[in-house]
């Protein structure tokens, strides 16, 4: 139904706390460089205005769209051009072009320092003094670094953050309580960020149809007892919600997400037997719980889908009459039978089936032509299965750090033109797949591995798009979203690359490395490894192992030395010389 004042409608639906949080996220995602204090001032102004509209929907400007209201606020910021350059040009445009312009200026890799967690005591003091401000800072810091973070989900993580602090700040050893719990929240939030970025990429590059296909496959896997019509309804709603969030309509997105959760809980009988526990929770937790829900049990004795999709003489007629419905049904039937496949694989199979019908239905004997489609699926299924097997075996052999290094070497050889920090970030994230997925039961490994890798590679594509340097990466990133992972896996050593000349300063280290946290030490070593590969793309595994082993020993020895600086200064050049020799 139409509302006189959209902002009043959203304020009433969401409540003041969530409304303010979402407005803060929206502003932080659009203007990523503004300090918290500036944003919070805008948030308060918008909230006060929304309250006047709740009191009187006919009040001045209350009938304006939320984009108009938000855009006007952003464009009124003093010195916008000084801080944001050409983003200020957006302000000369009218809606909806102005909002589109803001979206195009979102920066996936903003020049912001890594978010440093304060000391436990300091954190607890500032949390206890002003919890609202503390959590506001959290929303702001995460949102500006992840401009596509799914806003209602970020509210959920802020709630989790709040829970952890409330619990741990009363403990005697605050750090021991906070560190593992906050690490767990951070890890989940980072994965959520790359997953949502992938959804927005899908929406931006390939439109709603592509996203809806993804949603149909995912929902069919989770709710195999639901009928196709139910799955289609859920997928349509989910597509709308994600379109809104990716498009910056965060209030509408969060409101619609809560509505979808409500609908699912009112219709459990036709969706899934697993929903009840989620439905007893408050709104943010309920939606999150439903998003992470385990798969319902597959009905036993589902028949072979060959009858309807291969053996039926009317396949071409059914396909021609309603292509999207027929293909949607195929995707639904296949996905509900295969929770052990990744969504990417299911979409590749559906795409293969569509291509087969397009070809065969134009031929003289269609059934004879499409009758072999099953055999044609085999390599598509075997490829990711083999990928999981070989990578999990390698992870089990090397552990996470060693596995990251193996991936780093592999990807630096594939795309040596890509900047070292980007390669290191990608390899570290790709390497985490082992810890995340390889320990799972067999049936959960493939979907976990492939869908996670796809999301990480999407991040690589998004960063590469900003400054394209590798033709191979551009080629993999330009193709279909579901073909990206196989495309990257198939890349080999880039023979066109002219090796980087050996620069001693790249491999010169100082005593400051000794005081770095383990993670930062690893990044330093991995940076050196990537640079080595760029210098010698065809270095053997043994050569790289020798050099990296030498390097580790050198750091270890000098960090234990009485005069660290002197050790690094004298031993460093020897290490560089030995490394050059080992790689000659």
């Amino acid at each position: 139904e139409a509302h006189k004042s959209e902002i009043a409608h959203r304020f009433k639906d969401l409540g003041e706390q969530h409304f303010k949080g979402l407005v803060l996220i929206a502003f932080s995602q659009y203007l990523q460089k503004c300090p918290y204090e500036e944003h919070i001032k805008l948030v308060q102004e918008v909230t006060d205005f929304a309250k006047t509209c709740v009191a009187d929907e006919n009040a001045e400007n209350c009938d304006k769209s939320i984009h108009t209201l938000f855009g006007d606020k952003l464009c009124a910021i003093p010195k916008l051009r000084d801080n944001y350059g050409e983003l200020a040009d957006c302000c000369a445009k009218q809606e909806p072009e102005r909002n589109e312009c803001f979206l195009q200026h979102k920066d996936d890799n903003p020049n912001l320092p890594p978010f440093q967690r304060p000391e436990a005591e300091a954190m607890c003091t500032s949390f206890q003094e002003n919890p609202t401000s503390f959590l506001g800072h959290y929303l702001h810091e995460v949102a500006r670094r992840h401009p596509y973070f799914y806003a209602p989900e970020l509210l959920y993580y802020a709630e989790k953050y709040n829970e952890v602090l409330t619990q741990c700040c009363t403990e005697s050893d605050k750090a021991a309580c906070l560190t593992p719990k906050l690490d767990a929240v951070k890890e989940k939030a980072l994965v959520a960020a790359v997953r949502q970025r992938m959804k927005c990429s899908s929406m931006q590059r390939f439109g709603e149809r592509a996203f809806k296909a993804w949603a149909v496959a995912r929902m069919s896997q989770r709710f195999p007892n639901a009928e196709f019509a139910e799955i289609t309804k859920l997928a349509t709603d989910l597509t709308k919600i994600n379109k809104e969030c990716c498009h910056g309509d965060l209030l509408e997105c969060a409101d619609d997400r809560a509505e979808l959760a409500k609908y699912m809980c009112e219709n459990q009988a036709t969706i899934s037997s697993k929903l009840q526990a989620c439905c007893d929770k408050p709104v943010l937790q309920k939606s999150q719980c439903l998003a992470e829900i385990e798969h319902d049990n597959i009905p036993a004795d589902l028949p072979s889908i060959a009858a309807d999709f291969v053996e039926d003489k009317e396949v071409c007629k059914n396909y021609a009459e309603a292509k999207d419905v027929f293909l949607g049904t195929f995707l639904y039937e296949y996905s509900r039978r295969h929770p052990d496949y990744s969504v990417s694989l299911l979409l590749r199979l559906a795409k293969k089936y569509e291509a087969t019908l397009e070809k065969c239905c134009a031929e003289g004997d269609p059934p004879a032509c499409y009758g072999t489609v099953l055999a044609e699926f085999q390599p598509l299924v075997e490829e990711p299965k083999n990928l999981v097997k070989t990578n999990c075996e390698l992870y089990e052999k090397l552990g996470e750090y060693g596995f990251q290094n193996a991936i780093l070497v592999r990807y630096t050889q594939k795309a040596p033109q890509v900047s070292t920090p980007t390669l290191v970030e990608a390899a570290r994230n790709l390497g985490r797949v082992g810890t995340k997925c390889c320990t799972l039961p067999e049936a959960q490994r493939l979907p976990c591995v492939e869908d996670y890798l796809s999301a990480i590679l999407n991040r690589l594509c998004v960063l590469h798009e900003k400054t394209p340097v590798s033709e191979k990466v551009t080629k993999c990133c330009s193709g279909s979203l579901v073909e990206r992972r196989p495309c990257f896996s198939a890349l080999t050593v880039d023979e066109t690359y002219v090796p980087k000349e050996f620069k001693a300063e790249t491999f010169t280290f100082h005593s400051d490395i000794c005081t770095l946290p383990d993670k930062e030490k690893q990044i330093k070593k991995q940076t050196a490894l990537a640079e080595l590969v760029k210098h010698k793309p065809k270095a053997t595994e043994d050569q790289l192992k020798t050099v990296m082993g030498d390097f580790a020993q050198f750091v270890d020895k000098c960090c234990k030395a009485a005069d660290k600086d002197n050790c690094f200064a004298t031993e460093g050049p020897n290490l560089v010389a030995r490394s050059k020799e080992a790689l000659a």
């Epitope: 004795d301 099953l374 049936a443």
Partner: nanobody, 124 residues
Framework: EVQLVESGGGVVQPGDSLRLSCAAS????????MGWFRQAPGKEREFVSA????????YYANSVKGRFTISRDNSKNTVYLQLNSLRPEDTALYYC?????????????????WGQGTLVTVSS
């Protein structure tokens, strides 16, 4: 991890019968689709027959329809293949396979667990 062990193979004359058995262990048998495949010397592995979890659906390759019968006993964690009117072209190594999730029943790549096989030789 499901383990499958086939038995019942042997040397028979054309027109004779055999009953193959496949005993499963290590998983919840009643949640698996069970299938039989065969591989003749020098040929590719081919689908023979499959049966759904509660025996509601059965599938057969055209070459064995009307001669072979698949059945299962979930209480004994065993699947059977009754081979009647055997022909020389039925000579092959017969494999039992289990699939937790399947769309096709007839596609070998949808089966995750395989036995070592039992040899059936039909010769006069």
């Amino acid at each position: 991890e499901v383990q499958l062990v086939e038995s019942g193979g042997g040397v028979v004359q054309p027109g004779d019968s055999l009953r193959l058995s496949c005993a499963a262990s290590g998983g919840t048998f009643s949640t698996y689709v069970m299938g039989w495949f065969r591989q003749a010397p020098g040929k590719e592995r081919e689908f023979v027959s499959a049966i759904s979890q509660n025996s509601i659906h059965t599938y057969y390759a055209n070459s064995v329809k009307g001669r072979f019968t698949i059945s299962r006993d979930n209480s004994k964690n065993t699947v059977y293949l009754q081979l009647n009117s055997l022909r020389p072209e039925d000579t092959a190594l017969y494999y039992c396979a289990a699939s937790r999730f399947t769309s096709w029943y007839t596609a070998d790549y949808e089966y995750d667990y395989w036995g070592q096989g039992t040899l059936v030789t039909v010769s006069s």
